[in-house]
């Protein structure tokens, strides 16, 4: 949908001066040739003919894969996660050797409360999504457990998560601390030690748009680039129009080369256009200069 | 599934003692924990005893030295002996159990439940 079709015109002529015939083709970009049975096809930059028309790589569009989109997709995903990895002394439960059996109703009792106990815990954290239990160990229960964190994909997803494992921090040291055995006896839902609560590592989803636009622009990384709009990446090149980066060809065509983004300059009836963008106009009868 | 069934519940005057007791079936009675809990009109369920499978027992301050809670775990059956009762022991007393070798008195702890039996101290 964010890519030009090409708009074909008398003739086309480069920023340079010199006059090329459309569709144009890089010279500097580099030509293979795919021969599949009788049927000889021009498909370059790596593209395939199927018996009917070239299947071109991105970036790579046109009859014959020889022009170069102007965006990319780039699919973020919709959500991302962190996981944290935590471990918590419960005091208020002995251990018994059925608790590391998880399928032992001791296990699945004990999964219940500490599930309660934890959504309890961190029901103010929008992100929080469960936990998970890892592994119960003695002591009296060691529990090594997963909590899990999911907030949507936005530019600005990673100090959402980080916000949010802080919080997760915060929230469990609390309640370690304040829920405690008094007398041998708990009057909470689970009683923890103090200090049994440990961080040990956090996951959190790594996603780059900047990265998956470079790799999937090949040769042309270094033109291609990231914008936002509605808070999604999109993977353009300057030739995309309507974005800060968009180069403006004014009487012209924008086409990507290995060099970059240039300006194929118009030559209609009555005028030729030049420059960079190709923003100057001659009349022909005149030889008269328009800015 | 677990089933609880407490009785020995009734009428006794200030000063007097009762014993209830709770059959237990469903479960392997001697591992985890049992416990006592009572609720009096208007006012939230309160953890009384508890008694776990390693013989550790644990009282709520307002009955320490009154009551003493036991189990037979031949017959299934965990019992409670309530002396010295006093008006503010009136309450429907549950029995409740836990697979769990538990050191808690918060309702929320336990999840299964009897259905209770009437306890009023009197004159």
């Known amino acids: 949908p964010l890519a030009t079709i090409p708009v074909s015109t008398t003739s086309l002529t480069s920023s340079e001066g010199s006059t090329i015939s459309t569709p144009s083709v890089d010279i500097s970009t580099p030509v293979t040739t795919s021969i599949v049975g009788d049927q000889c096809s021009r498909c370059k930059n790596g593209g395939f003919w199927d018996g009917l028309k070239c299947q071109c790589l991105t970036p790579y569009y046109g009859e014959s894969c020889e022009e170069v989109v102007n965006s990319i997709d780039i699919a973020p995903p919709e959500t991302v996660s962190a996981q944290m990895e935590l471990t918590v002394t419960v005091t208020s439960v002995k251990f018994t050797d059925e608790l590391k059996n998880h399928s032992s109703q001791e296990f699945r009792e004990f999964n219940k409360t500490f599930t309660e106990q934890m959504n309890i815990v961190y029901s103010g954290i929008p992100e929080y999504v469960g936990v998970n239990i890892t592994n119960l160990r003695l002591g009296s229960v060691v529990v090594e457990h997963d909590v899990l964190l999911r907030t949507k994909y936005t530019p600005e997803y990673k100090t959402a998560l980080d916000n949010a494992t802080e919080v997760v921090k915060q929230k469990i040291t609390k309640v370690t601390t304040e829920q405690i055995m008094t007398n041998d006896n708990c009057s909470a839902l689970m009683c923890f030690n103090t200090t049994g609560t440990q961080v040990q590592n956090i996951t959190v989803t790594q996603y780059d748009p900047v990265e998956e636009c470079r790799q999937k622009a090949e040769e042309y990384e270094d033109y291609f680039l990231v914008e936002y709009r509605d808070q999604k990446p999109y993977c353009i090149s300057p030739c995309e129009s309507g974005f800060n980066a968009s180069k403006n060809c004014n009487h012209g065509k924008c086409q990507m080369s290995q060099n970059g983004a240039r300006c194929l300059c118009v030559t209609t009836e009555t005028h030729w256009y030049s420059g960079e963008d190709c923003n100057q106009g001659t009349q022909k009868s005149h030889h008269h200069h328009h800015h | 599934e677990v089933q609880l069934v407490e009785s020995g519940g009734g009428l006794v005057q200030p000063g007097g003692s009762l014993r209830l007791s709770c059959a237990a079936s469903?479960?392997?009675?001697?591992?985890?924990?049992m416990s006592w809990f009572r609720q009096a009109p208007g006012k939230e369920r309160e953890g009384v005893a508890i008694?776990?499978?390693?013989?550790?027992?644990g009282y709520a301050d307002s009955v320490k030295g009154r009551f003493t809670i036991s189990r037979d775990n031949a017959k299934n059956s965990l019992y409670l002996q309530m002396n010295s009762l006093r008006a503010e022991d009136t309450a429907v007393y549950y029995c409740?159990?836990?697979?769990?070798?538990?050191?808690?008195?918060?309702?929320?702890?336990?999840?299964?439940w009897g259905q209770g039996t009437m306890v009023t101290v009197s004159s």
């Open positions: 409740a159990a836990s697979f769990l070798v538990l050191r808690a008195l918060n309702p929320k702890a336990w999840h299964y």
């Open positions: 008694i776990s499978s390693d013989g550790w027992t």
């Open positions: 469903g479960f392997t009675f001697s591992r985890g924990s």
